[in-house]
Amino acid sequence: IVLRPSRVHNSEENTMRALTLKDILNGTFSYKTFFPNWISGQEYLHQSADNNIVLYNIETGQSYTILSNRTMKSVNASNYGLSPDRQFVYLESDYSKLWRYSYTATYYIYDLSNGEFVRGNELPRPIQYLCWSPVGSKLAYVYQNNIYLKQRPGDPPFQITFNGRENKIFNGIPDWVYEEEMLATKYALWWSPNGKFLAYAEFNDTDIPVIAYSYYGDEQYPRTINIPYPKAGAKNPVVRIFIIDTTYPAYVGPQEVPVPAMIASSDYYFSWLTWVTDERVCLQWLKRVQNVSVLSICDFREDWQTWDCPKTQEHIEESRTGWAGGFFVSTPVFSYDAISYYKIFSDKDGYKHIHYIKDTVENAIQITSGKWEAINIFRVTQDSLFYSSNEFEEYPGRRNIYRISIGSYPPSKKCVTCHLRKERCQYYTASFSDYAKYYALVCYGPGIPISTLHDGRTDQEIKILEENKELENALKNIQLPKEEIKKLEVDEITLWYKMILPPQFDRSKKYPLLIQVYGGPCSQSVRSVFAVNWISYLASKEGMVIALVDGRGTAFQGDKLLYAVYRKLGVYEVEDQITAVRKFIEMGFIDEKRIAIWGWSYGGYVSSLALASGTGLFKCGIAVAPVSSWEYYASVYTERFMGLPTKDDNLEHYKNSTVMARAEYFRNVDYLLIHGTADDNVHFQNSAQIAKALVNAQVDFQAMWYSDQNHGLSGLSTNHLYTHMTHFLKQCFSLSD
């Protein structure tokens, strides 16, 4: 299936040009999306091109500026947040990135009623997290690992926690491992729907081993970065959840929420918190051996002033074939009765589907079914449930939005997006206003992305929010590569692949092949999305064929494929890449003497193992920031898929699956190893150990480090990285510069 045909015709060939590396590095062909910042059923805020904050009312068609760019500029604000009572706006400046989601910033409160900044009892700086209550204008914020509460922006703060300590106790914000591997947020506090209560997590990292690495900076001596980071099998953070009454916090104090007995009996994680009403909260817990999850619904008992989590409101989710959930355990979406909920988990056939839970999980009513997967529940209203899936036309790499009418019986299903812009749009997400009165659809491809606004009742398109016209015009004279998404059937395994072909691709010719791999558990690389990136350039300008293959362990095609890698990381992911390459060679247009593989992070691990597989298929390859041994990576992630590195569990496979164990096999390939020295995620240690093993085996290889760069290798390092990798590949494929 050709998803993005090149617009090359002989008549216009002269005016067309190939992509250049400079195009990619400059972001010349980047696209925009439009996500409304909903503030009611029919109103949203948006930051205009000239940086004014504008309020749009869909029903009246009116818009007005609530905050001028002058005010924004006066404090160098890069972000904002309107209080729900619309009296105040917080302005965020001095953004300073920490880890993937976390950052600190300076916050100013602007009073919209008098057009002045709030003076007196100003917020301290830098703040780690700040948010408005869902109703009114209470503020909760985290400063120096402690949580504070303001009843009004001009009021003095009430300090909720006092034990916060850098790298030791984290209140209201996650530690490194919870941020990266469990919550995927910068915050760990949650307001109840009307702002009566504030729930928060406390993470105690006192006993966690610390990863230390040098940050070279510009000083005479490098400084040492210390992060409590539990690697596989190490001591984990100890988590506790508290809830405080924000109306009179000084009186009752924080109430600790009890952990379900079956969870508390051994090491465990807290995985998420969902408020149902002001007096009902749902907590999700997970055993350290991550195949058992418990969802616990707790009620506030006014007479006791306590949170009661009865055993009858504990719902157990267990996997017997792998780990609980997909990448994370799914979160519940509660219905209007405030006790039943919708949740995605595996059905009896091993496909993730929406289930309705009224009393027990055993009696769950399956809402969706089929040999495809429900991926996200966006919104449940009184009569509709909106979700995304990859059902349409049986392409796992697509996302369409569906509506199920839950108000009628039997429920009817409608695909909202399948036929809207069928060629252009096959991969959607959505953003809903209150009560799903309106929604925005954001289409990511395969054509040029487009964002549109829709009526939540009729699904009618109201207007285009962003259609990337400038990008469309800029691409008119570019020879884009062709892309196709197809599948291979091998030994009862379906391997979906995306192939990116040079613009003048000719099946009778031979092309160098580059495999781009990620391959991590529950990931998906073969997606019907638009991208003009480095591999687009390699196909367009350098005439390479690039292929991405989703093998065993990848997501959204059922548990058989997903859980195939359970406790065996580094085996089937690699096998499936190799199998796919052999199939590509059989297609007849691949030069089998010029095949390379590259990947980043988990992909760096897979590419390294593929190069060291001893097949002789690969001439060269690149590993960027690879994992080299699962003993070096984070406990939460690693143990989910690998169990524990202990003799009585899975130590043997931990040892067998290292890159270092295969050092000898790198002798007959050209290997480029790349890593940032300040990688907080996949530590430089991983590449240092590969390099040591290769040196000890007297195997030649190439390497590049990026001083003081993290896992993302951003900024000028990005340019250097892609330039360096381009040279390496061109040399490997004997392409002239």
Partner: antibody, heavy 117, light 108 residues
Amino acid sequence: EVQLLESGGGLVQPGGSLRLSCAASGFTFSSYAMSWVRQAPGKGLEWVSAIIGSGGITYYADSVKGRFTISRDNSKNTLYLQMNSLRAEDTAVYYCAKGWFGGFNYWGQGTLVTVSS
Amino acid sequence: EIVLTQSPGTLSLSPGERATLSCRASQSVTSSYLAWYQQKPGQAPRLLINVGSRRATGIPDRFSGSGSGTDFTLTISRLEPEDFAVYYCQQGIMLPPTFGQGTKVEIK
């Protein structure tokens, strides 16, 4: 009816130790934060320490930090204050009170601690 | 720590009169975190005005609390004989919670 009953006070030499108890009844003890407040003879009130319902968080006034330990046994509906390294300035009537940092709506009758050689 | 200064130190009034007791904080507190107590000789303190200017359970409506920021007032609209006692204000916004030094309301 809510009742708080302190015990364990008495005469102790400087450097000595005492353990105060506060037996609670008439409410769900484990749900509520509790505090100790003291009053030196003829003087005003001074907050000493607080503990949340589960016992998981405790706080102390600087004047007693490192010497006093607040704890509770929810199965016995009892609050404790372990006082070590006592000084003359710790002489006071010690009250247990229901509450966290404020709004102490129920108080015990108090127990007198005298630190003297 | 927040210092609470109560004034006057002693207030001499007759039954039936209005009593106005003042409590000034060294930094902003707000009424959400200020409480008032009554203490009679040989007895434990009794909560009068809970945080948020709410009268505690069983407290007659002649007692009322007001104020914001740093200045707070306890008003007893008509003094009854049983109201002659020492009154303390207390803040709970910042650790450590602190009490004022007290105002003694005595019979004139």
